[in-house]
């Protein structure tokens, strides 16, 4: 008799999830020699232990503590780049500007980027059919709790000037419900962080508006100021040129506004 299985609203665990996590761990520790002390088998065991045999709507940050401990990593606290709804450009930027880091440039972020996972209560199986959706099912699911945990720790580690890349093409340039708006903003430490600098990325070629005046950016400024952190904002009118100028800062066309 086939066992009854909970049907969730979200996509199931990414296929070959264990193999993918292991392979990513090996690759990451290979190209980051300072992390070669990490035992990827132990990392996978801790990752698995956070959600296997647990109800996928009952996951806590505590469940991920063994993994957090194994993945402890020091990144330069003044070189942190946060992002919201503009992941690809943020990653392209840190691939060029090698001394800056997004969460996905750290081991734990790299392991889980773009993956989905969940288990089932009281069985050691991984659920490849469906996983809880944050809105339709529950917020305390394995994926959401993981990103909340690592995002909080990442923001807490930041110091000096923290940069955030925001998508100027969206109706809410700053969204209070995003991971940045709901977790990272509130976990920047005022005693360590002097300024949050927002880079608003323009979508249209002819868009010359000052998106730093957008109401949602003003809302972000207000939240940040209330936390005793200074706020500044820059428009990035030409993201393609912006990246090009990060690659080749000596280029004569890079002195004008981008």
């Amino acid at each position: 008799v086939p066992r009854w299985r909970q049907q969730w609203s979200g996509p199931g665990t990414t296929k070959r999830f264990p193999e993918t996590v292991l392979a990513r761990c090996v690759k990451y520790t290979e190209i980051h020699p300072e992390m070669r002390h990490v035992d990827c088998q132990s990392v996978w065991d801790a990752f698995k232990g956070a959600f296997i045999s647990k109800h996928p709507c009952n996951i806590t940050e505590e469940d991920y503590q063994p993994l957090m401990k194994l993945g402890t990593q020091t990144v330069p606290c003044n070189k942190i780049l946060l992002w919201s709804r503009i992941k690809d450009l943020a990653h392209q930027f840190t691939q060029v500007q090698r001394d800056m880091f997004t969460l996905e440039d750290t081991l734990l972020g790299y392991l889980a980027d773009d993956l989905t996972w969940c288990g089932e209560f009281n069985t050691s199986k991984i659920n490849y059919q469906s996983c809880p959706d944050w809105r339709k099912d529950c917020s305390n699911n394995p994926v959401s709790v993981f990103w909340k945990t690592v995002s909080r720790r990442f923001a807490e580690a930041a110091c000096d000037v923290v940069h955030v890349m925001l998508n100027g093409s969206r109706s809410k340039i700053f969204d209070k419900n995003s991971t940045f708006g709901s977790v990272e903003v509130h976990n920047l430490q005022p005693e360590k962080v002097q300024t949050l600098e927002a880079w608003v990325i323009h979508g249209g070629r002819e868009d010359s508006r000052d998106l730093c005046q957008d109401p949602t950016i003003k809302e972000l400024e207000s939240i940040i100021s209330k936390r005793n952190i200074q706020f500044s904002c820059k428009n990035i009118y030409r993201p393609d040129k912006f990246l090009q100028c990060v690659k080749n800062p000596e280029d004569s066309s890079c002195t004008s506004e981008i």
Epitope: E19, L22, A23, C25, V26, T29, E30, I31, P33, R36, H37, V38, D39, C40, Q41, S42, Q95, R98, D99
Partner: antibody, heavy 116, light 108 residues
Framework: QVQLVQSGAEVKKPGSSVKVSCKAS????????FSWVRQAPGQGLEWMGG????????NYAQKFQGRITIVTDESTTTVYMELSSLRSEDTAVFYC?????????WGQGTLVTVSS | EIVLTQSPGTLSLSPGERATLSCRAS???????LAWYQQKPGQAPRLLIY???SRATGIPDRFSGSGSGTDFTLTISRLEPEDFAVYYC?????????FGQGTKVEIK
């Protein structure tokens, strides 16, 4: 501290095979990766191939494909490299290194002399 | 495969001087996956720099790396007696991983 200790020097006849061992200690073995790099007398460095035990994956340089075999013994944390159909141009110091592409720890090297 | 060409072949300098070693790739090295190694006579090489500019554990800060794409540089700000050796660059962005032919830094 990671240590890679290699087997001793060998003298081989052309056409024969050589198997060099490398005992690893001081770090996670199964999820580490290992490669072999050779250096002919007075020459530069040449990557031959690598292995990632936990993934069961090997990657060999085209030049050595068909002649090289890299395996590991997890029970003794030892990496082996076998090179067959030896010729005089294979005379070199063979280094066991940690890493499949970027090499942060090196063994002391094993001199293999191919001579009739 | 990516061919790495190092220049000069030999660099004759005195202790205390600055050494600048060049490594040029035949095609762009992805993600600046370029390393530098030092090798002294009768010894195995040791990793100095990875990711074009990150110093490996225990490497003194007189060693620095820079560059991206196809042009990379290793700089030794003030040569110490123990720095006279052969230096190799290596790319690990595209298999097969390849090394330059080496630059010998010798005492003038």
């Amino acid at each position: 501290q990671v240590q890679l200790v290699q087997s001793g020097a060998e003298v081989k006849k052309p056409g024969s095979s050589v198997k060099v061992s490398c005992k690893a200690s001081g770090g996670p073995f199964r999820s580490s990766s290992f490669s072999w790099v050779r250096q002919a007398p007075g020459q530069g460095l040449e990557w031959m191939g690598g292995i990632i035990p936990i993934l069961g994956k090997t990657n060999y340089a085209q030049k050595f494909q068909g002649r090289i075999t890299i395996v590991t013994d997890e029970s003794t944390t030892t990496v082996y490299m076998e090179l067959s159909s030896l010729r005089s141009e294979d005379t070199a110091v063979f280094y066991c290194v940690r890493g499949s592409s970027l090499f942060d720890y090196w063994g002391q090297g094993t001199l293999v002399t191919v001579s009739s | 495969e990516i061919v790495l060409t190092q220049s000069p072949g030999t660099l004759s300098l005195s202790p205390g001087e600055r050494a600048t070693l060049s490594c040029r790739a035949s095609q762009s090295v992805s993600s600046s996956y370029l390393a530098w190694y030092q090798q002294k006579p009768g010894q195995a090489p040791r990793l100095l720099i990875y990711g074009a500019s990150s110093r490996a554990t225990g490497i003194p800060d007189r060693f620095s790396g820079s560059g991206s794409g196809t042009d990379f540089t290793l700089t030794i700000s003030r040569l110490e007696p123990e720095d006279f050796a052969v230096y190799y660059c290596q790319q690990y962005g595209s298999s097969p991983w390849t090394f330059g032919q080496g630059t010998k830094v010798e005492i003038k």
